[in-house]
């Protein structure tokens, strides 16, 4: 099966790499614009230059192209705790990231939020915090993991998943309650 090609891909595939078919004359292959520039005017004829102009401030193209407009630079999302790692240039979009001792959690493919790495208090670090993953903690005896924090088994209710980990403690609590002290 031949994969379905869009009109633009079909047009481009007829020309050699780095060129595209003139939209008004499919016998002409024009040279694509370099990254950092965009297409202002198609080449007038074979072997003649394509009119490419540099992207204006606040816009970019990251690869060779025949776009009529440059792409708008991304803005880092302050409300998500993001910080600018590198600013936008004509040939590269803004790079956003997180502060030191934070990790990225992706809510969707193109949206991430910065959260503080867990410190594993009342536990030990099983896996260190990474760019896109929180610290993995192993809790000490008498503690269980809840929302990536080690919480005392005294906070474990019978209905929760922690009962297996905290079983001895729960039995002790129950035993204390049952023994009628006067």
């Amino acid at each position: 099966l031949v994969p379905h090609l869009g009109d633009r891909e079909k047009r481009d595939s007829v020309c050699p790499q780095g060129k595209y078919i003139h939209p008004q004359n499919n016998s002409i292959c024009c040279t694509k614009c370099h990254k950092g520039t965009y297409l202002y005017n198609d080449c007038p004829g074979p072997g003649q230059d394509t009119d490419c102009r540099e992207c204006e401030s606040g816009s970019f193209t990251a690869s060779e192209n025949h776009l009529r407009h440059c792409l708008s630079c991304s803005k880092c999302r302050k409300e998500m705790g993001q910080v600018e790692i590198s600013s936008c240039t004509v040939d590269r979009d803004t790079v956003c990231g997180c502060r030191k001792n934070q990790y990225r959690h992706y809510w969707s493919e193109n949206l991430f939020q910065c959260f503080n790495c867990s410190l594993c208090l009342n536990g030990t670090v099983h896996l260190s915090c990474q760019e896109k993953q929180n610290t993995v903690c192993t809790c000490h005896a008498g503690f269980f993991l809840r929302e990536n924090e080690c919480v005392s088994c005294s906070n474990c209710k019978k209905s929760l998943e922690c009962t297996k980990l905290c079983l001895p403690q729960i039995e002790n609590v129950k035993g204390t309650e049952d023994s009628g002290t006067t």
Partner: nanobody, 119 residues
Framework: EVQLLESGGGLIQPGGSLRLSCAAS????????MVWVRQAPGKGLEWVSH????????YYADPVKGRFTISRDNSRNTLYLQMNSLRAEDTAVYYC????????????RGQGTLVTVSS
């Protein structure tokens, strides 16, 4: 006690419009970034949109971009989601939530309102 109460859901035909509301109480609404998420039948939670504290910065997930508009009225402690050109794939329970701070889970989320898009 934090309370988030969604309303405005219902059965709507494809191409139709709905406006969801979320009444907030028990916290300083104007200090929080607010979020709409949705859960389609048999699927996980999907981020729909969010709006910063002052209503200046907004975000829309690709499937709803150009069709949905998020807004807020801080004087009324209310969050809105205007949904236009509705499609069958927009069928879901819609929840409003406070943007999490401690980790990737929702400490404060409403009970949800069901939106069904069907002819």
């Amino acid at each position: 006690e934090v309370q988030l109460l969604e309303s405005g859901g219902g059965l709507i035909q494809p191409g139709g419009s709905l406006r969801l509301s979320c009444a907030a109480s028990g916290f300083t609404f104007a200090h929080e970034t607010m979020v709409w998420v949705r859960q389609a039948p048999g699927k996980g939670l999907e981020w729909v949109s969010h709006i910063d504290r002052v209503g200046q910065d907004t975000y829309y997930a690709d499937p709803v971009k150009g069709r949905f508009t998020i807004s807020r009225d801080n004087s009324r402690n209310t969050l809105y989601l205007q949904m236009n050109s509705l499609r069958a794939e927009d069928t879901a329970v819609y929840y409003c939530a406070v943007l999490p701070k401690r980790g990737p889970w929702f400490d404060y989320r409403g009970q949800g309102t069901l939106v069904t898009v069907s002819s």
